[in-house]
């Protein structure tokens, strides 16, 4: 949904501009007062002039005060009350409820499955390249390189557990020290937060939903980035994570236990393994410089194999390579020795779609990437639609109160910590922080959960994923037990340290403020969300990676000025907002810089120029798809099908007064003013025609 037009001086009293209105043209905002403002500080408010002859139904839509866009929308129930229904109506209502619940669980199942397939797709597309990142010898000496490798690999394979398991196997085989592995783990923590940010992009159609969803997703990113910003230098200086975890590992005499329980995977695996199955060992082998692995396919062909250990005569380059002098001989030309060779006999092929296609990994990856993103998007839309229809009236009130209400005084502070525990527990159940945070994102978007509550849930999710890793480490074989446990503990203590930094004191909850700021910008300039993703998860890590390869002098030479400029800008920004008088007049705002350096408006114009030609066909496609969807769902004929086309319609709003069109499952008189929606009029023909 489009946000309200931005006004520099919104009138607090709506009667002043509703009474004497004579024109249907919307009042244009007074730009004279905007000089000091940056894009994300403007408060969105709607101001309309209405003709007295218009229906009062329209007036319900008008906000009577300046609303906070972060306030949760009021999801009011317009349906017939239970007591007013007849027996048939009650039965129908019950069946509808059960049907919706089944649909919700079904779409949720496919949503989780598509996340799993998405991860597989990313591994097929970028897994081998990700593996090669690890084989870089500079990781040992350069923690910054380790960090960006952790980010890039996790982004490319869409799974922190994959990158972590590679690190574990590298540490176990002495290719990497625990000290060098810690920054990679930190990077993996950052990389894993891209998944729910991608999920948030799926809600781009509705501005206010997108604002909340994107902020809710990026709160995870900011927490991870800020934690690394503080804790990586601390770790480099003190090695506290390494020391603490080493003490713990050495103080216990661990016996490797049973495998970590697969909880959610038990349900999703039967389906996902019909789509594709991967041989994850290939990426690890590439990381460990195994040349033969580079030509292996990641797509698993044989699922049932028989491994037989036999003693085999093999040739070796020299006597030095012999297992023992007495087990060495010559045939006159070559030196031979006897080695235990594991011979793998293929018994049964896997049962997935791609088993007989023999397509290259990249092709399979791209196919799965497209399919999984479409399924992910479709499921997300349907989940949001179903939740929107379910979470109304009493249900909404109960759920919102349960989730977002604090404990009574003086225990209010405990609520957040309980949320952390809930997040950790839920993540432990689903065995993936990506799945949990991705499921959380649409709930934040539709306004069931506040960002303030989503934040501790996300932090808990970070803890939950490390407890899973600790369990998995305890189940690992003897040779990797120590290293995998120490790395899992490093991950755990890193997240604990991050929580201690950015949660206990409300003032330090910077990730929330930063995420809200980004949410505001992204709601206004939706393209910026994609830019954010590309810059933070690809460009910055790749630039640091490139500079690190060039050597310390280059990295420092480029990095120091950049860091200096960033610090300077932040200090200036802080002084401008807190005590501008201490600054010279010129520095009290950013106007001394060219507009493109302190505003996104010029960039927006450029991007609009490029994306303009694609908007109309996209809009038509969106409408057709939506109408088909409405038919299938049995929505009212006049349902609103053009949320994604709002931008195009905003231009038309200048010609006519926006009248709220009914939403699916809504009644005409439902008030959703708190959501801050201004709907473009749907003509009669548009409502009935398909």
């Amino acid at each position: 949904m489009a946000p309200w037009p931005e006004l520099g001086d919104a009138q607090p009293n709506p009667s002043k501009y509703l009474e004497g209105a004579t024109s249907q043209q919307p009042i244009t905002p007074d730009k004279s007062k905007e000089t000091n403002k940056t894009d994300n500080t403007e408060v969105p408010v709607t101001k309309f002039e209405l003709l007295p002859t218009y229906s009062t139904a329209t007036l319900i839509e008008e906000p009577t005060e300046v609303d906070d866009p972060w306030n949760l929308p009021t999801l009011q129930d317009s349906g017939i009350k239970w007591s007013e229904r007849d027996a048939k109506g009650k039965i129908l209502c019950v069946f509808q409820g059960i049907g919706r619940l089944i649909l919700l669980l079904g779409f949720l199942y496919f949503f989780v499955c598509s996340l799993d397939v998405l991860s597989s797709a990313f591994q097929l597309v970028g897994g081998k390249m990700a593996g090669q990142f690890f084989s870089n010898s500079s990781i040992m000496s350069n923690p910054l390189l380790g960090l960006v490798i952790g980010v890039l690999v996790t982004v490319f394979v869409q799974s922190s557990s994959t990158s972590t398991s590679i690190v574990v196997s590298m540490v176990a085989s002495s290719l990497l020290t625990v000290r060098a592995a810690i920054p990679i783990i930190m990077g993996a923590n950052i990389g894993t937060s891209i998944t729910n940010t991608i999920v948030a992009l799926m809600q781009v159609g509705d501005r206010s939903e997108f604002r909340r969803a994107f902020a809710g997703a990026t709160v995870h990113d900011f927490f991870n980035w800020l934690s690394v910003l503080v804790l990586l230098p601390v770790e480099v200086a003190t090695h506290y994570l390494e020391v603490v975890t080493q003490l713990i590992v050495e103080s216990f005499h661990f016996k490797n236990g049973e495998d970590a329980p697969d909880l959610l995977k038990v349900i999703t695996k039967p389906f996902t393994k019909l789509i594709v199955q991967l041989d994850k060992k290939v990426i690890s082998q590439i990381a460990m410089n195994d040349e033969t692995a580079k030509n292996k396919s990641l797509v698993k062909i044989w699922c049932k194999t028989f491994t037989n250990m036999t003693q085999m005569n093999v040739t070796v380059p020299s006597m030095a390579n012999c297992t023992s002098p007495s087990l060495c001989w010559t045939d006159g030309i070559q030196i031979w020795t006897m080695k235990n060779v594991t011979y793998k006999e293929n018994i049964a092929k896997c049962q997935h779609i791609f088993v007989n296609f023999h397509l290259p990994d990249l092709a399979v990856g791209i196919i799965l990437l497209i399919i999984s993103l479409l399924v992910l998007c479709g499921c997300l839309i349907m989940i949001v639609k179903i939740l929107g229809s379910v979470l109304k009236g009493q249900v909404a009130t109960v759920i919102k109160k349960t989730i977002n209400t604090d404990f009574p005084f003086p225990f209010a502070w405990l609520t957040g910590y309980l949320a952390i525990l809930v997040g950790a527990g839920m993540t432990f159940i689903v065995q993936s922080s990506s799945v949990f945070t991705s499921a959380l994102t649409p709930l934040i978007g539709i306004g069931v959960i506040t960002i303030e509550r989503a934040y501790p849930l996300t932090l808990g999710s970070n803890i939950g994923t490390t407890t899973t890793a600790i369990l998995a480490a305890l189940a690992s074989p003897g040779n990797t037990l120590r290293s995998s446990l120490q790395i899992a503990l490093c991950h755990f203590f890193f997240n604990i340290s991050g929580i201690l930094l950015w949660y206990p004191i409300p003032f330090t909850r910077l990730p929330i403020r930063m995420a809200k700021g980004l949410g505001n910008i992204s709601a206004k300039y939706r393209w910026f969300a994609i830019f954010y993703l590309i810059i933070f998860f690809f460009l910055i890590p790749l630039t640091v990676f490139g500079l690190s390869l060039a050597g310390w002098p280059v990295l420092v030479g480029v990095g120091v000025p950049v860091v200096f400029i960033i610090i300077l800008v932040l200090c200036l920004r802080l002084l401008q907002s807190r005590c501008p008088r201490v600054l010279p007049k010129k520095l009290q705002n950013w106007n001394f810089l060219p507009l493109c350096m302190h505003s996104l408006k010029p960039w927006d114009a450029v991007i609009s120029k490029f994306t303009g030609p694609f908007q109309m066909p996209c809009c038509c496609c969106c409408r057709v798809c939506c109408r088909v969807c409405c038919l299938l769902c049995g929505c009212p004929k006049c349902c609103r099908c053009s949320k994604c086309c709002q931008d195009l319609e905003e231009g038309q709003e200048a010609q006519g007064v926006p009248v709220k069109a009914p939403e699916t499952f809504d009644n005409i008189t439902i008030s959703r003013e708190a959501q801050g929606e201004v709907r473009a009029p749907d003509s009669k023909t548009e409502c009935t025609a398909l």
Partner: antibody
């Protein structure tokens, strides 16, 4: 059945060279090494070297290095051993022997070629 | 180079006798030892390889044992056709080397 047929006896003058051939049949020529062993009159066996016909790789006894050359012709399944700078102590029966795959035991031997070096 | 020392150099025995020949290596050769039989004017014939394994077609009265540096070759019951010279050979490392031989004669 496996057969190794060697060329006939040779009489050479000191300083000259001799090239002994060994034609094989009854097995895949390129899979097994071919060894050359000599036996001086009334003496024991002495290994000269070996060739792997599949790649042409050779290994020689240090004692003969620089004087011996072994070659293989896959088209005729024949191996050759050439010994140069002959001395009187090189008078011996020269055998070609097929090496067993993967180790240095010799399972089939040629009939031997007597090379006599005298002035 | 690895030296192989066979003993005895000469051995007289009668048909039906049990005969044992030993072969000592100057260093550990594992089990990379072969035994050959050579009759006058003929080419050597492989009897045993890997110290204990009989070559195809070799009668079971011929056997070998040992590992490391000491090896023994045994004929359990001498037959008239068994009178010949016997050689041990190591193929643990290049150059391949042979023992000086043991001549088995009729008593």
């Amino acid at each position: 059945q496996v057969q190794l047929v060697q060329s006939g006896a040779e009489v050479k003058k000191p300083g000259a060279s001799v090239k002994v051939s060994c034609k094989t049949s009854g097995y895949t020529f390129t899979t097994n090494n071919m060894h050359w062993v000599r036996q001086a009159p009334g003496q024991g066996l002495e290994w000269i070297g070996a060739i792997y016909p599949g790649s042409g790789a050779t290994a020689y006894n240090q004692k003969f290095k620089g004087r011996v050359t072994m070659t293989a012709d896959t088209s005729t399944s024949t191996v050759y051993m050439e010994l140069s700078s002959l001395r009187s102590e090189d008078t011996a029966v020269y055998y070609c022997a097929r090496g067993m795959y993967g180790h240095g035991a010799m399972d089939y031997w040629g009939q031997g070629t007597l090379v006599t070096v005298s002035s | 180079d690895i030296q192989l020392t066979q003993s005895p150099s000469f051995l007289s025995a009668s048909v039906g006798d049990r005969v044992t020949i030993t072969c000592k290596a100057s260093q550990d050769v594992g089990t990379a030892v072969a035994w050959y039989q050579q009759k006058p004017g003929k080419s050597p014939k492989l009897l045993i390889y890997w110290a204990t394994t009989r070559h195809s077609g070799v009668p079971d009265r011929f056997s070998g044992s040992g590992s490391g540096t000491e090896f023994t070759f045994t004929i359990s019951s001498l037959q008239p056709e068994d009178f010949a010279t016997y050689f041990c050979q190591q193929y643990s490392s290049n150059p391949l080397t042979f023992g000086q031989g043991t001549k088995l004669e009729i008593k």
